[in-house]
Amino acid sequence: MAVTACQGLGFVVSLIGIAGIIAATCMDQWSTQDLYNNPVTAVFNYQGLWRSCVRESSGFTECRGYFTLLGLPAMLQAVRALMIVGIVLGAIGLLVSIFALKCIRIGSMEDSAKANMTLTSGIMFIVSGLCAIAGVSVFANMLVTNFWMSTANMYTGMGGMVQTVQTRYTFGAALFVGWVAGGLTLIGGVMMCIACRGLAPEETNYKAVSYHASGHSVAYKPGGFKASTGFGSNTKNKKIYDGGARTEDEVQSYPSKHDYV
């Protein structure tokens, strides 16, 4: 029950997150004009990844797309790429996770296949969330840099006679939507990965078998491989004798997680 709930919740959280990433990517308010101390402005500028808009106090709003590709800043292109990669990975992850849901029966799909699919979608969600967070953070960093640069040259003019007010831009709503959405997708992905562990079919626990050899007696444990690689409890340089008396299952025998359904 806990696994199904964790998987279902992970799916829903990721779904909301990806919807948020798509919304943020499409939004026009990635950067908005800084209004200083004046909340009322006659002309309000805001920009997205795909177009820039101007809203006059008259209510008239005009948006213009960035019809050039080569003329755009490399950072903006990078942010676009990160957001698109995030959306694509998230969409694929959603598709995979639908078939991986424990509550949905598709033919005679084994639990091991569902576990693998859950893990795959979980990883995809994690990467998708990270892409969104990275994209939004890169854009935010770009804004902060430009903000302080334009503050430094707030007014430029010839001998102070003619002044040009430089438009400063600050964080737009899309950045916060993107951060939250990326975070949700990441959390959803982690939940899917956790659910995967519980979905994996439980291996048989073999008891230790004693073999009596001539001259001396050594107990051969299935955990010998683990101990020799330093992942088990035996991390010291003790020699583990392996006489080959091991079944195939024993080679990959890890302590199984018991899921109480």
């Epitope: 004009q33 004046n38 009322v40 402005t41 006659a42 002309v43 500028n45 920009q47 820039s52 808009c53 101007v54 006059e56 106090s57 008259s58 209510g59 008239f60 005009e62 213009r64 003619v162 002044q163 040009t164 007010v165 438009t167």
Partner: antibody, heavy 118, light 113 residues
């Protein structure tokens, strides 16, 4: 046809108050900002402030804060401007004007002359 | 506040001749977001309210004769009447429509020579 009809001329004593009205017709009153402009004889036009008939939000020129108060009656499609503590320099023609694309005033009231005289 | 300065204060032009009125702002009225100049021109005849002629520095309001044209960018703007008619006698004002408070020029009185 869009029309902005203002109230008639007023003669007031110094220290008194006056309320000028501007009735709008021929368009959706709540969709456009209503602005008020002052014009003293032989002087340049001065922007007083604005009010949005839908939200009721206002924005004033610092120079007129405390002097002018903008209100409205949505049901009557009428905007009001009250001028308080009148002085001789408040003698002017006051216009209401509708803001349109380009932040320009496309329709103006006929003007209300306020004369402050003792 | 943005200061708008018009020149000349008064202008006398013969009928059919070209009339040019200049307007200078203390700050740029060019908005980088849409590359539009937020400058408006009005015509005011005695006893009447101002009439909108041109907005965005060069866009003529509907119903305004095409002899009226606006030009300029940033801080320097011009209103041109290509062929003066008798009904064009009026006071012309330029207005900053870019930042609050909106400000107007002192006006240019256009007369017939």
């Amino acid at each position: 046809e869009v029309q902005l009809v203002q109230s008639g001329a007023e003669v007031k004593k110094p220290g008194a108050s006056v309320k000028v009205s501007c009735k709008a017709s021929g368009y959706t009153f709540t969709s456009y900002w209503m602005h008020w402009v002052k014009q003293r004889p032989g002087q340049r036009l001065e922007w007083i402030g604005m009010i949005h008939p839908n939200s009721g939000s206002t924005n004033y020129n610092e120079k007129f804060k405390g002097k002018a108060t903008l209100t409205l009656d949505k049901s009557a499609s009428t905007a009001y401007m009250e001028l308080s503590s009148l002085r001789s320099e408040d003698t002017a023609v006051y216009y209401c004007a509708r803001l349109k694309t380009g932040n320009s005033f496309d329709y103006w009231g006929q003007g209300t002359t306020v004369t402050v005289s003792s | 506040d943005i200061v708008m300065t018009q020149s000349p204060d008064s202008l006398a032009v013969s009928l059919g001749e070209r009339a040019t009125i200049n307007c200078k702002s203390s700050q740029s009225l060019l908005n980088s977001g849409n590359q539009k100049n937020y400058l408006t021109w009005y015509q005011q005849k005695p006893g009447q309210p101002p009439k909108l002629l041109i907005y965005w520095a060069s866009t003529r309001e509907s119903g305004v004769p095409d002899r009226f044209s606006g030009s300029g960018s940033g801080t320097d703007f011009t209103l041109t009447i290509s062929s003066l008619q008798a009904e064009d006698v009026a006071v012309y004002y330029c207005q900053n429509a870019y930042t609050y408070p909106f400000t107007f020029g002192q006006g240019t009185k256009l007369e017939i020579k």
